[in-house]
Interface confidence: medium
């Protein structure tokens, strides 16, 4: 999937199975991603879970779990908010899209989580305080958790590369873990380009990813998850000058 | 990644040590962080097999959750945390203690936090 | 074999610091925590405080805090403790144990001990 | 600081049982599951024989055993030994509040 950290990193990753996204006192996000496509090195959200830590006298421990085609609009517990505690509505899950769109609100801890399914895959947006972010007890062992340090090098997928090839099947051939054609061939680099600009007139890096999402898989929701991240940094990101990201951003090989 | 059995065992030792620690007329606190420290233990699973403090962990833990009586299922307890205040500090007073000004308790602490953003979409 | 080997006895002046180590071996050292102790001569054991070396979390007794620092490097397996503001009452023998695994707080391996004598 | 209270010394003869008594208060002992006790030699280091107050590592006799009644820990010595003539201290772990007892001379008559 294509991850933009909590420094504003873009970065298109090809982990396959369970990463954290977050983790520290509060909250620990989980994500876990399958390849698109079979022998495609490019992979997608297929299962999210949420874990809300109990939290003093407000909230009692919370998981949120939602996977392909099943977009709750509740905990695993069933329950919509914190729980029995005097401050359980200091934590409550709204659905804005009965199965496509959920909105979590943490106010105990100033954060808002914001999960679609876009096709049959899922996305995931939030809106944290970094002082929230930064209250871990183990700096040294937080590893490999995506939102802070972005995934491994040996992970990412340098998009930005293929859209310099204004040829589908060269962005298609790249994004395989072997020749094997990945998505099908009549979806032309014009017709992504068209698609993608109807619903992200801007080219940044948003623009870029709905691209190469098309030309790697040839399924059009693809547009509509990049356009619905937009969306959602619109709504969450807290700096207005940052909304669009554009190449000057992307984290260069060695770095 | 290494097995992270320490972070459990040390969060347990801060959750149940002086000030902290689990009266036996107060169990269910004591639960509380004996469930904290299993769900722990069960997040660093995976990277922890074969490490002789992990299994004594798991031991220790099943002996004192039947020792105390504890069920499986329950809250948790919150280990101390460094960086938001302390639970007295999201307390407002209030004619009515019952309520609870946990919406508050984030933003009395840092009136105008800096907030970050992370999202995952596509492929 | 589990073995704790601590560095060699130390003679001090008042006011100077002072830094023992502790090398682990035969476990894995990021999954036990390091405790130090000390025994002054003809005295008692006492307690200083404890590391984690997977985090680097430390705990203090209360009379030495301001006094003492507990590192580790785990590239190493060691462990440190340093005391500052030597005084006379501080000449003991300190030992570096390993904190047990599983639940309890408990001290199973410890090292020969390490002797720093503070005189002027 | 709270204390942990030892007696200074208590003697047996060779086959004979001894007590010694760990004394604090409900924190630091009574609600305690981390109340250990370590046996030390003359010039040695200190070695573990009893933790959770009643478990004994492997390698440490069976002779050697725990209890804890209300703020009282004790270790006992059955069927002493010549090799049991050590000090030994008890030891609670309370988070800033963590100390030794005094510690006990045992001594085999």
């Known amino acids: 999937p294509h991850l933009r950290t909590f420094t504003d990193r873009f970065q298109t990753c090809k982990v396959q199975g369970a990463w954290p996204l977050i983790d520290n006192n509060y909250l620990n996000v989980q994500v876990t991603n399958t390849p698109v496509l079979p022998g495609s090195a490019a992979t997608a959200t297929s299962k999210l879970t949420i874990i809300f830590k109990n939290f003093q006298e407000c909230v009692d421990q919370k998981v949120y779990q939602a996977e392909m085609d099943e977009l709750p609009a509740a905990f695993v517990d069933g329950s919509k908010n914190g729980g029995d505690k005097h401050g359980a509505n200091s934590l409550k899950i709204t659905e804005k899209v009965s199965g496509q769109h959920v909105e979590i609100r943490a106010k105990y801890i100033g954060t808002t989580i914001v999960v679609r399914q876009v096709g049959r895959y899922l996305t995931f947006a939030v809106r944290v305080p970094e002082e929230v972010v930064n209250a871990v007890e183990d700096w040294d062992s937080q590893g490999l958790y995506l939102c802070l340090r972005g995934c491994p090098l040996n992970q990412q997928i340098d998009f930005q590369a293929f859209h310099t090839n204004t040829e589908g099947t060269g962005a298609r051939r790249l994004a395989a873990a072997s020749p094997a054609p990945t998505a099908p061939e009549t979806f032309p680099y014009e017709t992504a380009v068209a698609k993608c600009k109807e619903k992200l007139p801007v080219e940044d890096l948003y623009y870029q990813a709905c691209v190469f999402d098309l030309l790697t898989t040839g399924d059009v929701n693809f547009t509509l998850a990049a356009y619905y991240a937009l969306e959602d940094v619109k709504m969450l990101h807290s700096n207005k000058d940052k909304l669009h990201l554009y190449e000057r951003t992307r984290d260069l090989p060695g770095r | 990644s290494p097995c992270k059995i320490l972070k459990c065992n040390s969060e347990f030792w801060s959750a149940t040590s002086g000030s902290h620690a689990p009266a036996s007329d107060d169990t269910p606190e004591f639960c509380a962080a004996l469930r904290s420290y299993a769900l722990c233990t069960r997040r660093t699973a995976r990277t922890c097999r074969g490490d002789l403090a992990y299994h004594s962990a798991v031991h220790g833990i099943e002996d004192l959750m039947s020792q105390h009586n504890c069920s499986k299922d329950g809250p948790t307890s919150q280990p101390r945390l460094h960086t938001l205040p302390p639970a007295g500090d999201s307390q407002e007073r209030s004619d009515s203690p019952e309520i609870c000004h946990c919406e508050k308790s984030f933003h009395k602490h840092s009136a105008t936090p800096n907030y970050t953003h992370c999202g995952l979409f596509g492929d | 074999e589990v073995q704790l080997v601590q560095s060699g006895a130390e003679v001090k002046k008042p006011g100077a610091s002072v830094k023992v180590s502790c090398k682990a071996s035969?476990?894995?050292?990021?999954?036990?925590?390091i405790s130090w102790v000390r025994q002054a001569p003809g005295q008692g054991l006492d307690w200083m405080g404890w590391?984690?070396?997977?985090?680097?979390?430390?705990n203090y007794a209360q009379k030495l805090q301001g006094r003492v620092t507990m590192t580790t490097d785990t590239s190493t397996s060691t462990a440190y403790m340093e005391l500052s503001s030597l005084r006379s009452e501080d000449t003991a023998v300190y030992y570096c144990a390993r904190v047990g695994s599983g639940p309890y707080y408990y001290m199973d391996v410890w090292g020969q001990g390490t002797l720093v004598t503070v005189s002027s | 600081q709270s204390a942990l209270t030892q007696p200074r010394s208590v003697s047996g003869s060779p086959g004979q049982s001894v007590t010694i008594s760990c004394t604090g208060t409900s924190s630091s002992v009574g609600d305690s599951i981390y109340v250990s006790w370590y046996q030390q030699h003359p010039g040695k280091a200190p070695k573990l024989m009893l933790y959770?107050?009643?478990k004994r590592p492997s390698g440490v006799p069976d002779r050697f055993s725990g209890s804890k009644s209300g703020n009282t820990a004790s270790l006992t010595i059955s069927g002493l030994q010549a090799e049991d003539e050590a000090d030994y201290y008890c030891?609670?772990?309370?988070?800033?509040?963590?100390?030794f007892g005094g510690g006990t001379k045992v001594t085999v008559l």
């Open positions: 590391i984690s070396p997977y985090s680097g979390n430390t």
């Open positions: 035969g476990y894995t050292f990021t999954s036990h925590g």
């Open positions: 030891f609670s772990y309370a988070g800033t509040d963590t100390l």
């Open positions: 959770d107050v009643t």
